[in-house]
Every structure is written in structure tokens, then in C-alpha cells.
């Protein structure tokens, strides 16, 4: 029997055991976060699946994810939202220590999808484990990209107080207008709820003592934010390892100097 023809995309296929992984992550999340104890993970998976199964994977819309996003009513306390761009690992290490601050991936929907890839095929109930659309080579309206755009928008919209963002000072564009932070989150912070955005620019080299807050792209970010009537602050984090250590042990004498 010849295998049925399948669309070939340029990106890697759906993560192995995707349904089982999402369901298991959901159950684990509800066990670790008792405020979500009443969430029915089978229903969450059904809504997730419904967003992309049987749909042409280059024609996914934010509307497709709305049933799932309706679940995302988890609220982050004011002053406790941490956004990040191109420096995910450090942001997550930080919130693992500073347990009262939250990245998108610390919320249920972000936690479910973190580091996963998925797509379906038009008019079949199958998941495509062979290939999925690549954002650049195939299309931007693919299931993964649209998911992150949708939940990132919602995450930014619900932020309040002083919002923090971690930026990678080792990159040529410390602030990149084309990143999810630059293209989605920045523009969906609500000025009536958000007093300020504080950027933490993370330095890469140990000997790097430049003031990266003066970088042209940071000035561009400041301009965008200020035009939205949100105040902007910037801090250099010269030693990320030291920074994390001081978050873990704030009483350490070497941390008290600020």
C-alpha cells in the first residue's frame, strides 16, 4: 500500500508524542499549581487540538486559538510580569528562583507549548510528524507562530504595574523590533495599567563594562515605550551569574552593594 501524499514543509515535524506531552504537562502543572486544580486537562488538550487539526497549516489565525486562550485567565500580580527576548534560559532560571515573578512559560498555556512544535494537515485528523511550516521559508501563519503571537499578546495585555523585560546584550540588536517582544508584547502593554517598563540588559562577556542602556536599539525601545505614555527604565546586568546568585542569596555581603 502506497503511503498517502503528504505536504512537505521546510521545518521540523511535530514533536514526538505531542498529545501525550501536552496532556502530561497540563496534569503536572495543575498538580504543582493548586489554584489550577479544577482545570480539566482533557478539555484543554481538545481545545489545543481543535486549533490546528484538519486545518491548512499556513492559514492558522488567532481566532483558531480563542477557545484555548479563554482558559488563559490566569492573572499575574502587578509588578510581577517578566518578559524576555532572545534570553529565555536566564529568564526562566530567574523565575525559578524568584518564585513570585512570572514569564509566559510559567503560565499554563506557555508551559504546555514551551519548546514544542506541532502542525496538522488540511482535511485529515492526523498530526504531521514529518514536517511543519518554517516561519521564513514557508509561512508565518503556522500553528506554532500564531500560538505564540496569540498568547504573548494576551500576556502583555494583562500585565500591570512595572513590567520587566530581560534583553540579550550579546546580540547585535539588543532590542529587535521583529522579535515577539518587539512586534507583539511592546505594542500590547496597556498604558492605563502599566506604569513603566524596566529593561534588564544582560551582558555576555565578563570584561564588558559598557553601558548597553545607551545602545541605539535600546533608545529605539525607549522611544516606542515613551510614545505609548509608559515610563522606561534600563539597567545593565554586567554579571548574570552574580545576578542569579544574589537573587538566591540576597543577604550575601557581596550583594548588598547594589
Amino acid at each position: 500500500v502506497l503511503p498517502r501524499w503528504r505536504q512537505q514543509w521546510s521545518g521540523s515535524g511535530t514533536t514526538s508524542r505531542f498529545p501525550e506531552t501536552v496532556l502530561a504537562r497540563c496534569v503536572k502543572y495543575t498538580e504543582v499549581h493548586p489554584e489550577m486544580r479544577h482545570v480539566d486537562c482533557q478539555s484543554v488538550w481538545d481545545a489545543f487540538k481543535g486549533a490546528f487539526i484538519s486545518k491548512y497549516p499556513c492559514n492558522i489565525t488567532e481566532e483558531d486559538y480563542q477557545p484555548l486562550v479563554k482558559l488563559g485567565t490566569q492573572t499575574v500580580p502587578c509588578n510581577k510580569t517578566l518578559l524576555w527576548s532572545r534570553i529565555k534560559d536566564l529568564a526562566h532560571q530567574f523565575t525559578q528562583v524568584q518564585r513570585d515573578m512570572f514569564t509566559l512559560e510559567d503560565m499554563l498555556l506557555g508551559y504546555l507549548a514551551d519548546d514544542l512544535t506541532w502542525c496538522g494537515e488540511f482535511n485529515t485528523f492526523e498530526i504531521n510528524y514529518q514536517s511543519c511550516p518554517d516561519w521564513r521559508k514557508d509561512c508565518s501563519n503556522n500553528p506554532v507562530s500564531v500560538f505564540w503571537k496569540t498568547v504573548s499578546r494576551r500576556f502583555a495585555e494583562t500585565a500591570c504595574g512595572v513590567v520587566h523585560v530581560m534583553l540579550n546584550g550579546s546580540r547585535s540588536k539588543i532590542f529587535d523590533k521583529n522579535s515577539t517582544f518587539g512586534s507583539v508584547e511592546v505594542h500590547n502593554l496597556q498604558p492605563e495599567k502599566v506604569q513603566a517598563l524596566e529593561a534588564w540588559v544582560i551582558h555576555g562577556g565578563r570584561e564588558d563594562s559598557r553601558d548597553l542602556c545607551q545602545d541605539p536599539t535600546i533608545k529605539e525601545l525607549e522611544s516606542i515605550i515613551s510614545k505609548r505614555n509608559i515610563r522606561f527604565f534600563c539597567k545593565n546586568i554586567y554579571r548574570p551569574d552574580k545576578f542569579l546568585q544574589c537573587v538566591k542569596n540576597p543577604e550575601d555581603s557581596s550583594c548588598l552593594s547594589g
Partner: antibody
């Protein structure tokens, strides 16, 4: 076995205050979410408030928010409901309930009657 | 505040099967577990079903629960006289940040 015993109900005038207590035994009280649920005469069950374990987070029904305060004292294995600015529509039997790990009300007290009338 | 919708009454003869429906929305039943409680007048309510279809120990297997989309149902098979009671469904509601109960269904054994 699990026991939940409510007390503190009674007759109170509109605008008055009352504090309900729930004495818990037979389980590790500090581990569980706890709730108050009420039933007005001839009406159905209505959730009133819940309090989490750990550093307590509180949740309230819209009908009581700003007037009622749920609290707990883990050292005394006790749950409380402070009711202020009482109204006639708050007249009900108030039940104390223990929540299970999936949010279900696994155990209930026998209830205490609160009557708000002039 | 809007609760969950249940029929006010249901009845059947001894030994029959009775089903009670409970309808809600995506903010409650849609994404959250459904619970069922039995309430006999003058007694404390009793948990019958949790996590949509799970029975606590001690609850007879004549009671079964199911959920589909934004609706749920409780079935009582082999109806007995002691099943005469009020039955309530409940679920967490995201839009209210609290639990919602159904209006209650009075089951009568004819």
C-alpha cells in the same frame, strides 16, 4: 474520620455583623483549601468563599465580596467567615467544606443557620 | 450571577434509569472539572462525582457522570427510594474566579 463543625449562626438585624467558625478534625487542616457554601430557604446551594492552603489566597462570590471575609487559623484547625453589612438575602444555612485535590468539596459540616431580619 | 442550568425535576420508577443534565459555558464546564452533589433535606450535602466521572469510595456504581463540551450529565441507574434527593452539579468558573452550582434537580422515585 473527618469532622467539620460550624458555629456562630443566629439572628441578626440587617446591617449587622456575625462571625462563623468551623472546627476541623480528622485530617491535616493546613494542607487543604477550605470553603463556605450556603443554602437560602427554598433555594439551591451557593458557593460563598474559599481560602487556599499555604500563604492564603482568598476567593469570593460577587454577592458577598467586600462584605464577607474568609480566614483560617491553622494552629487552631479553624476556618472563619466574618460577615458584615448583612442583608436579608444572606439568610441561609452556611456550610463549611473541605476541598479535595481536584477542587471538589469532599467533606461538609452539618451547617449553621444565619437569619437576617429586623 | 449566572449559574449552571439544570432541569428542576426528574423522576422514575424504582429500578429505572434517570439522567440529569447540566449545561454551562467554556468559562466553567468547558475547561473545568464537573462535580455532582446529593443533598437530602436536613443533612450535609454529599459528594457523588468528581473530575467529571470519578466516584469517591462508598458511592454506588449506579451513579455515573459524563461531560461533553460545555455540558455534563449525571445518570442514576437502578433507581431506589433512597435516591430521592436534590442533585447539584458544580464547576469552577474562570470569569467569576469562583465556583458555580447548578440550580438543583429534585429526583422523585414514583
Amino acid at each position: 474520620q473527618v469532622q467539620l463543625v460550624e458555629s456562630g449562626g443566629g439572628l441578626v438585624k440587617p446591617g449587622g455583623s456575625l462571625r462563623l467558625s468551623c472546627a476541623a478534625s480528622g485530617f491535616t487542616f493546613s494542607d487543604d483549601y477550605m470553603s463556605w457554601i450556603r443554602q437560602a430557604p427554598g433555594k439551591g446551594l451557593e458557593w460563598v468563599a474559599s481560602v487556599s492552603n499555604g500563604r492564603p489566597t482568598t476567593y469570593y462570590a460577587d454577592s458577598v465580596r467586600g462584605r464577607f471575609t474568609i480566614s483560617r487559623d491553622n494552629a487552631k484547625n479553624s476556618l472563619y467567615l466574618q460577615m458584615n453589612s448583612l442583608r436579608a438575602e444572606d439568610t441561609a444555612v452556611y456550610y463549611c467544606a473541605r476541598e479535595g485535590w481536584s477542587g471538589e468539596f469532599t467533606d461538609w459540616g452539618q451547617g449553621t443557620l444565619v437569619t437576617v431580619s429586623s | 450571577q449566572a449559574g449552571l442550568t439544570q432541569p428542576p425535576s426528574a423522576s422514575g420508577t424504582s429500578g429505572q434509569r434517570v439522567t440529569i443534565s447540566c449545561s454551562g459555558s467554556s468559562s466553567n464546564i468547558g475547561f473545568h472539572f464537573v462535580y455532582w452533589y446529593q443533598h437530602l433535606p436536613g443533612t450535609a450535602p454529599k459528594l457523588l462525582i468528581y473530575k467529571n466521572n470519578q466516584r469517591p469510595s462508598g458511592v454506588p456504581d449506579r451513579f455515573s457522570g459524563s461531560k461533553s463540551g460545555n455540558s455534563a450529565s449525571l445518570a442514576i441507574s437502578g433507581l431506589r427510594s433512597e435516591d430521592e434527593a436534590d442533585y447539584y452539579c458544580a464547576a469552577w468558573d474562570d470569569s467569576l474566579s469562583g465556583y458555580v452550582f447548578g440550580s438543583g434537580t429534585k429526583v422523585t422515585v414514583l
